[in-house]
Interface confidence: low
Amino acid sequence: ELCDDDPPKITHATFKAVAYKEGTMLNCECKRGFRRIKSGSPYMLCTGNSSHSSWDNQCQCTSSAARNTTKQVTPQPEEQKERKTTEMQSQMQLADQVSLPGHCREPPPWENEATERIYHFVVGQTVYYQCVQGYRALHRGPAESVCKMTHGKTRWTQPQLICTGETEPSQFPGEEEPQASPDGLPESETSR
C-alpha cells in the first residue's frame, strides 16, 4: 500500500531512507534539457522475493534537443552544485547501508538524472532526518518518520527534530513563508 502523503517537512532538514521497502517507486526524472527515452519506464520499482530485492526497470534520459545527441548539456553553476550534493548524498547513502530483507538499496545515479529524487513510499517505510549543513539538531529524540496505516488511512509519524543555525545557537530556526504555498512548510528536503 502506497503512502498517501510525502514524509513531513522539517525546516532546515533533509531526510533519507537507509533502504527502501519492496513496492517503493522512484520517478525517472531527468534534468533540464533532457527527457525520459520514449520506450523508458516512468519509474523504477523495488521488487523481490524472500531472499533478494532489486529495482525493476532502469531510468534513462536522452537529450530533448531537436537533434538526438548524447552530448550532455553543461549545467548552470547552481545546477552543478545541486547535482554534486545529490551525488555525494547517494554515495554516502550507499556507503552506510546494510542489506535488509525485503528492501532495496539506494539506486545508483543514472546519466542526466534530475537533481531531486521523487520517491513514492509504502506503508512501513522509515525515513531518517538530519539537519542541513550550517544547522544543528536541538531535538535529540527520534529524528525519523514511519509511514503507518491507521483506520484505513496512511500517515507519517512526526519526527522530533528542530534544526537551529550554528551561527546563532540561542535561536530557534525559521524559514520565511513562501507566499505561493501558505499551507506547507518550506521545501528543503532533497528527496520525497
Epitope: P8, I10, L138, H139, R140, G141, P142, Q158, P159, Q160, L161, I162, S170, Q171, F172, G174, E175, E176, E177, P182, D183, G184, L185
Partner: antibody, heavy 118, light 111 residues
C-alpha cells in the same frame, strides 16, 4: 496516553519562593520542548519560556527573563517553573505545554493555580 | 513584545459562521506559517485546534478553518454550535525565537 501532569495549587505570601512542576508521560519526554504559559485571572495567555528537557536548553520571553527560572530533570521527565521571591502580581494560573513539531503547543497540562497574598 | 491583536468578543447564532482575526507584524504572523489557534473552554486548559495557519490536529472538526494574508491570520468557525462557546487565542512563532499569543476573543453563541 500522552499527558502533562502539573503539581497542585499553591497559596503563598509575598517574598516567598516557589517551584511548581510538570511531568510528561506517554511519550519520549526528552525529545520535546516544554513551554510555560501564564494566565492571570480573567486575562489572556502569555508565553513565558521553554525548555528542552534532554539537555536543559532554555529560552525565555523578554518579559519574564530574570523573573522566573525554568529547569528540568530528565531522569524523572519533569519540567519546573520557579520564583525566588513571589509578588502579588504573580497570582495566576500557570500551564505547561508540549511543543509539537509544527511550533504549536499540542498537549497542555491542567494548570497550577498560584495565589500570592499577604 | 506586544500581544497579537484579536477582537475582544464576537457573537453569532447557532448554524452561522464567524471569523476571528489575529493581527501581528512582519516579525511574527507575517514572517512564518507557524500560526496556531487554541480553544479554551471555561475553567479548562487551552486546546490546539489549528496549526501551520490552517492544519487541524486529528479529532478537530472540519468546521474550524484558518487562513493568513500578510500580517493577519484568521480563524473561521462554520455551522456554529453551542459547545463552540469559548475563548479563542491565536499564537505565532516570532523572529525573536519566542512565541506570542493574541489577547483572546470571547465567542458567544446566542441562544
Amino acid at each position: 496516553q500522552v499527558q502533562l501532569v502539573q503539581s497542585g495549587a499553591e497559596v503563598k505570601k509575598p517574598g516567598e519562593s516557589l517551584k511548581i512542576s510538570c511531568k510528561g508521560s506517554g511519550y519520549s519526554s526528552t525529545s520535546y520542548w516544554i513551554g510555560w504559559v501564564r494566565q492571570m485571572p480573567g486575562k489572556g495567555l502569555e508565553w513565558m519560556g521553554i525548555i528542552y528537557p534532554g539537555d536543559s536548553d532554555t529560552r525565555y520571553s523578554p518579559s519574564f527573563q530574570g523573573q522566573v527560572t525554568i529547569s528540568a530533570d530528565k531522569s524523572i521527565s519533569t519540567a519546573y517553573l520557579q520564583w525566588s521571591s513571589l509578588k502579588a502580581s504573580d497570582t495566576a494560573m500557570y500551564y505547561c505545554a508540549r511543543l509539537g513539531s509544527a511550533y504549536a503547543f499540542d498537549i497542555w497540562g491542567r494548570g497550577t493555580m498560584v495565589t500570592v497574598s499577604s | 513584545q506586544s500581544a497579537l491583536t484579536q477582537p475582544a468578543s464576537v457573537s453569532a447564532s447557532p448554524g452561522q459562521s464567524i471569523t476571528i482575526s489575529c493581527t501581528g507584524t512582519s516579525s511574527d504572523v507575517g514572517a512564518y506559517i507557524y500560526v496556531s489557534w487554541y480553544q479554551q473552554l471555561s475553567g479548562k486548559p487551552p486546546k490546539l485546534i489549528l496549526y501551520d495557519v490552517s492544519k487541524r490536529p486529528s479529532g478537530i472538526s472540519d468546521r474550524f478553518s484558518g487562513s493568513k494574508s500578510g500580517n493577519t491570520a484568521s480563524l473561521t468557525i462554520s455551522g456554529l454550535q453551542a459547545d463552540d462557546e469559548a475563548d479563542y487565542y491565536c499564537s505565532s512563532y516570532t523572529r525573536s525565537s519566542t512565541w506570542v499569543f493574541g489577547g483572546g476573543t470571547q465567542l458567544t453563541v446566542l441562544g
